[in-house]
């Protein structure tokens, strides 16, 4: 009778609660990776940034993988991707090679199955950083919503890597899953 | 028989629908706070902005609290945080104190339990706003994914607050919960 | 007995799985629209951009509609809206009409029921693009969390449309639903 219904309902609810928590609330992939300043490339040409923290300070990762400088997707889905990149120069670091700079970020997706790399988002600015100012700073932010498949890799390319701000609040990128693929 | 199954299924589904709606679809915290222009500090030094609207125009808040100039977290979780800050100056407002400016935003997290403040995100640019142009404008956008605990507080610091654009579409910050903490 | 409980539980779980997938994981509206470069307006005045791709490359749409240059909301909810707009100029394209530019984006919401248009977000910068540099570039990113009702329309206005970067990774806007309205 009613006892049987209550027992079964508890059993169903319990299993559902487990399933819901597992499938939705706690298994949704995300990553927030912050720049590893001990290994920033020099120079002014466009380079891929391969050194990022994933487990210290604000950096964290769940149900995604960080390997060989790339953020690897483990779960198909639609993700919001973002990047914040800060550049700075102080006169005490010596003169810039040129006062006309192109400060750029490119968020790229690489597919292993079909070896190809494509830019998902780009942003930045040309800047004139004159010697009259003791300090220069500039930040770029990009973000967008993309379909990502398991095994695909996200990486960050920048121009002028030697000018990157090494603080964890300044130079970072990340992703979080919003939705399954239909 | 089948009637008993249908009745019980309806009962289970009903309770689950209520639970799901309550727990997921409608109880997810968020805030979108817009600048209160009646109380913007003067000067050029870095200050914390304490006057924001939470219930007029585009501004809104749910399952979070706005108090003493800070956005207070009421529910543990992973949140996407964002800020958009616009600066402007018109020659009719008089000369700038200096033509070399540092226009910056800092999104900070304060923990009451361990009284400490940390910058989660920063962005901005140094600018040369010469007297040759009648009008100057610059916007900063930052965003990122962070673990926030109940009781923690989010606040916004800017340089040159007297140059802030007071429009609700220009200067705002916000947060929305994406995911529970494992 | 236990067989009956298992059968009914499977039936309940099954229906719930369908409902959950339908209602949450796969029916959440989103759009990511990329600039259609074949139809960018000329000039430097503020214009509404009406030509966007919704089904090629990174562009995609689900449970929203793109019509007459506007992104139409089909489902009430709280959405995260974003835009990334890139401007560029190369000296080989001829001289700029003026070296002092205002490069801006406005994300607007139009309600059909009450014919009115309001700016949700704006961003940009005044720039001095001198003839001393062969190439100029600048990107704007804005994002925010807004309540949208079915039938409301999102559109993008920019200044200096002739300077827009036509790449899909450069000039785009989008939205994804985060939460139901209480």
């Amino acid at each position: 009778g009613s006892q049987h219904i209550r027992a079964e309902k508890a059993m169903v609810d319990g299993s559902w609660l487990d399933l819901a928590k597992r499938s939705k609330l706690e298994a949704q992939p995300f990553a927030h990776l912050t720049i590893n300043a001990t290994d920033i490339p020099s120079g002014s040409h466009k380079v891929s940034l391969s050194s990022w923290y994933h487990d210290r300070g604000w950096a964290k990762i769940s149900n995604m993988t960080f390997s060989n400088g790339k953020l690897i997707v483990n779960q198909d889905g639609f993700y919001y991707l973002y990047a914040n990149i800060c550049f700075r120069h102080h006169e005490t670091s010596g003169d810039l090679a040129t006062e006309y700079l192109q400060l750029m970020v490119y968020v790229t997706k690489t597919s292993i199955k079909i070896p190809s790399s494509h830019t998902l988002m780009k942003g930045g600015s040309t800047k004139y950083w004159s010697g009259n100012s003791e300090f220069h700073f500039y930040s770029i932010n990009v973000g967008g919503f993309f379909k990502l498949r398991s095994g695909e890799e996200i990486s960050i390319e920048v121009s002028n890597p030697s000018l990157l701000d090494p603080d964890q609040d300044a130079t970072y990128f990340g992703a979080f899953k919003v939705r399954d693929i239909d | 028989g089948s009637q008993h199954i249908r009745a019980e299924k309806a009962m289970v589904d009903g309770s689950w629908l209520d639970l799901a709606k309550r727990s997921k679809l409608e109880a997810q915290p968020f805030a979108h706070l817009t600048i209160n222009a009646t109380d913007i500090p003067s000067g050029s030094h870095k200050v914390s902005l304490s006057s924001w609207y939470h219930d007029r125009g585009w501004a809104k808040i749910s399952n979070m609290t706005f108090s003493n100039g800070k956005l207070i977290v009421n529910q543990d979780g992973f949140y996407y945080l964002y800020a958009n800050i616009c600066f402007r100056h018109h020659e009719t407002s008089g000369d700038l104190a200096t033509e070399y400016l540092q226009l910056m935003v800092y999104v900070t997290k304060t923990s009451i339990k361990i009284p400490s403040s940390h910058t989660l995100m920063k962005g901005g640019s140094t600018k040369y706003w010469s007297g040759n142009s009648e009008f100057h404008f610059y916007s900063i956008n930052v965003g990122g994914f962070f673990k926030l605990r109940s009781g923690e507080e989010i606040s916004i610091e800017v340089s040159n607050p007297s140059l802030l654009d007071p429009d609700q579409d220009a200067t705002y910050f916000g947060a929305f919960k994406v995911r529970d903490i494992d | 007995g236990s067989q009956h409980i298992r059968a009914e539980k499977a039936m309940v779980d099954g229906s719930w799985l369908d409902l959950a997938k339908r209602s949450k994981l796969e029916a959440q509206p989103f759009a990511h629209l990329t600039i259609n470069a074949t139809d960018i307006p000329s000039g430097s005045h503020k214009v509404s951009l009406s030509s966007w791709y919704h089904d090629r490359g990174w562009a995609k749409i689900s449970n929203m509609t793109f019509s007459n240059g506007k992104l139409i909301v089909n489902q009430d909810g709280f959405y995260y809206l974003y835009a990334n707009i890139c401007f560029r100029h190369h000296e080989t394209s001829g001289d700029l009409a003026t070296e002092y530019l205002q490069l801006m984006v406005y994300v607007t919401k139009t309600s059909i029921k009450i014919p009115s248009s309001h700016t949700l977000m704006k961003g940009g910068s005044t720039k001095y693009w001198s003839g001393n540099s062969e190439f100029h570039f600048y990107s704007i990113n804005v994002g925010g969390f807004f309540k949208l009702r079915s039938g409301e329309e999102i559109s993008i206005e920019v200044s200096n449309p002739s300077l827009l970067d036509p790449d899909q990774d450069a000039t785009y806007f989008g939205a994804f639903k985060v939460r139901d309205i209480d």
Epitope: F137 | Y100, Q102 | -
Partner: nanobody, 120 residues
Framework: EVQLVESGGKLVQAGGSLRLSCAVS????????MAWFRQGPGKGRESVGR????????YYADSVKGRFTISRDNATNTVYLQMNSLKPEDTAVYYC?????????????WGQGTQVTVSS
Amino acid sequence: EVQLVESGGKLVQAGGSLRLSCAVSGRTSSIYNMAWFRQGPGKGRESVGRIYWSDDNTYYADSVKGRFTISRDNATNTVYLQMNSLKPEDTAVYYCAGKTTKWSLEYDYWGQGTQVTVSS
């Protein structure tokens, strides 16, 4: 806190020289660098040059390079601005300023200013 007091400003003929002094007192150990600024009549404040506390390195605005020199006397905690080949456009109120952090254009401490007038 750090206190700054400028002196040495006066009327001088074009082509002449002048030395301004800035006496620094208080928590001088917190200073990252010291700078001289000037504000001409009807103009915004502009940087003239800077000296770094750690190594006494100096940097100058293009408009004064080769004519102005910044130096420091550690014993008396005084910063100097030696101005040679003065021009009428150098007429301004000159301020010394100090700051405590590297990555900022905002100076934390300011003197009251001293007037320099260059007549033609």
